[in-house]
Amino acid sequence: VPRWRQQWSGPGTTKRFPETVLARCVKYTEIHPEMRHVDCQSVWDAFKGAFISKHPCNITEEDYQPLMKLGTQTVPCNKILLWSRIKDLAHQFTQVQRDMFTLEDTLLGYLADDLTWCGEFNTSKINYQSCPDWRKDCSNNPVSVFWKTVSRRFAEAACDVVHVMLNGSRSKIFDKNSTFGSVEVHNLQPEKVQTLEAWVIHGGREDSRDLCQDPTIKELESIISKRNIQFSCKNIYRPDKFLQCVKNPEDSSCTSEI
């Protein structure tokens, strides 16, 4: 008789999840010599231990503590790039500007990027059918708790000048309900962070508006200023040219505004 299984509203665990996490860990430790000491089997065991046999609506930050410990690394605190609703460009940027880091350039972020996972209470099975949706089911699900935990700690680790890439094509360029707006902004440490610099990325070819004057950017500036952190904002009118100029800063066309 097939066992009754809880049906959740969200997609199930990404297929081949254990193999994917293990393979990503091996690849990351090969690419980053300073992480060669990491035992990827232990990393997988700690990852698995965070959610297997646990109710997928009852996950806590403490569940991820063993994984956090194994994922320890030296991320330069003054080279952190946060992003909101513009992940691809942020990652393209750090692939060129190799000394800067998004969360997904860390081991923990790299392991989990774009994956879904959950287990079931009292069984060692991974649920490949469905996982809790943050809105429709519960917020304390394995994926949401993971990202909230690492995002908070990434923001807490930041220092000096912190950059954030924001999507100028969205109706809310700064969204208080995004991970950046709800977690990272509030966990920047004023005693360590001097300035938050926002880069507003334009979408339209002929869009010459100053999106730094957008009401949601003004809202971000207000939140940041109240936390005794300076705020600055730059329009990136031509993201394609921006990336090209990061690759080739000597190019003569790179002296003009991008």
Epitope: T72, V75, P76, C77, R153, A157, Q194
Partner: nanobody, 116 residues
Framework: QVQLVESGGGLVQAGGSLRLACTAS????????MNWYRQAPGSPRELVAT???????TYADSAKGRFTVATDNAKATAYLQLTSLTPEDTGVYYC??????????WGQGTQVTVSS
């Protein structure tokens, strides 16, 4: 992994000065926030001073105007200059670094004793 070793502590008269040093394995202070903590007898550790790679410094109220934190990346060393010392400054001084996501590294501590 990160290893921190403090030195420079000792016995000093009230009003005197000391310079504490914290040497790290690898050039950690070029990329990480570095903290100095003090633990007075029978008390928990308290944060005394912080310095970022960009040179941004913060001090506990009790340290302002008397203590100065600095780093020398070439020597992979952080310093805490203590001046106008009082008996209340007596304690074990520790340097500390926290690596992402949240692993703490501490030195073994160096004893500072201020006699009146």
């Amino acid at each position: 992994q990160v290893q921190l070793v403090e030195s420079g502590g000792g016995l000093v008269q009230a009003g005197g000065s000391l310079r504490l040093a914290c040497t790290a394995s690898g050039n950690i202070f070029a990329s990480q926030v570095m903290n100095w903590y003090r633990q007075a007898p029978g008390s928990p550790r308290e944060l005394v001073a912080t310095i970022t790679p960009g040179g941004r410094t913060t001090y506990a109220d009790s340290a302002k105007g008397r203590f100065t934190v600095a780093t020398d990346n070439a020597k992979a060393t952080a310093y805490l200059q203590l001046t106008s010392l009082t008996p209340e400054d007596t304690g074990v001084y520790y340097c500390h670094v926290r690596l992402f996501p949240a692993t703490d590294y501490w030195g073994q501590g160096t004893q500072v004793t201020v006699s009146s």
